[in-house]
């Protein structure tokens, strides 16, 4: 079957995000991928969206992330914009209202996004073949 247009949009956004280095991409988020053996694909997407939403809600106006220079400010704003877009698209793909995120494990946002990109690319290669 054809790949969902949302999936392509997610991969495009993740490509942009993983190229970015900002003051806050080294901050930690809940690592939902650490123990996701018994988790459905939809649950994984829903939980990933939840983690991203928690991150940008908490750090959108964080002065440490906004930095002191214009470049740092704009890079952070761009990061938040992409995270919101990713969050929106992941919810669309998940089709779930809510999902629990209880893991204790942490990873940097940078590593979290790289892992998510790998998962999305694998999904894309399956649906496009």
């Amino acid at each position: 079957h054809k790949c969902d247009i949302t999936l392509q949009e997610i991969i495009k956004t993740l490509n942009s995000l993983t190229e970015q280095k900002t003051l806050c991409t080294e901050l930690t988020v809940t690592d939902i991928f650490a123990a996701s053996k018994n988790t459905t694909e939809k649950e994984t997407f829903c939980r990933a969206a939840t983690v991203l939403r928690q991150f940008y809600s908490h750090h959108e106006k964080d002065t440490r992330c906004l930095g002191a220079t214009a470049q740092q400010f704009h890079r952070h704003k761009q990061l938040i914009r992409f995270l919101k877009r990713l969050d929106r698209n992941l919810w669309g793909l998940a089709g779930l209202n809510s999902c629990p995120v209880k893991e204790a494990n942490q990873s940097t946002l940078e590593n979290f996004l790289e892992r998510l990109k790998t998962i999305m690319r694998e999904k894309y290669s399956k649906c496009s073949s």
Epitope: E19, T69, A70, Q71, F73, H74, R75, K77, Q78, R81
Partner: antibody, heavy 123, light 107 residues
């Protein structure tokens, strides 16, 4: 082509309010911050502030924080600047300009400017 | 706020001259500097961004250099259309600030 079209000249009374517009065309309006610049007759340029058309977030120069309001109307790709309680010091040419960025802000600059709106404050 | 100082404030020139305008920042701005040209009655026109990058369509007789706190704009073989006021602008941190300008006048 990329254009910023500003509203016409305005004559306003001291202590009232003035609102000028800047209509964008030829590019994705929500992708670039719009900045506002003031130029008094025969003088230099002064940065007033900026607005992100995608979400309406603003950042203002402290000197204008209490009197300037920046807004956007995404449906018409138009940015607005309102100046409250103007005095003769506010008689100036006001420009809107777009902040163009490349490579995740590896470089950025004002590449396109509106023609400017002349505001005259007089009783 | 970062202060930007330009010198000289005005300069008497002859067509064909090579001239250098200077801009000094009150603190380190790395290479976050733009140069603009403004002819009487016209809008500012971007010439140089990030200290030394020539904007699209700008003649190669314009060149910029510098980093940190000291910057220069050089115009070689001055043409009639170059008679204008030149402004530097720092893009290092908000609020963005401009120099007072250097006005070119024909001798």
């Amino acid at each position: 082509q990329v254009q910023l079209q500003q509203s016409g000249p305005q004559l306003v009374r001291p202590g009232t309010s003035v609102k000028i517009s800047c209509k964008a065309s030829g590019y994705s309006f929500t992708s670039y911050w719009i900045h506002w610049i003031k130029q008094r007759p025969g003088q230099g340029l002064e940065w007033i502030g900026m607005i992100d058309p995608s979400d309406g977030e603003t950042r203002l120069n402290q000197r204008f924080k209490d009197r300037a309001t920046l807004t956007v109307d995404r449906s018409s790709s138009t940015a607005y600047m309102q100046l409250r309680s103007p005095t003769s010091e506010d008689s100036a040419l006001y420009y809107c300009t777009r902040l163009k960025e490349y490579g995740n802000y590896d470089s950025f600059y004002f590449d396109v400017w509106g023609a400017g709106t002349t505001v005259t404050v007089s009783s | 706020d970062i202060q930007m100082n330009q010198s000289p404030a005005s300069l008497s020139v002859s067509l064909g001259d090579t001239i250098t305008l200077t801009c000094h920042a009150s603190q380190n701005i790395d290479v976050w500097l733009s140069w603009f040209q403004q002819s009487p009655g016209n809008i500012p026109k971007l010439l140089i961004y990030k200290a030394s990058n020539l904007h699209t369509g700008v003649p190669s007789r314009f060149s910029g250099s510098g980093s940190g706190t000291g910057f220069t704009l050089t115009i070689s073989s001055l043409q009639p259309e170059d008679i204008a006021t030149y402004y530097c602008q720092q893009a290092h941190s908000y609020p963005f600030t401009f120099g007072g300008g250097t006005k070119l006048e024909i001798k």
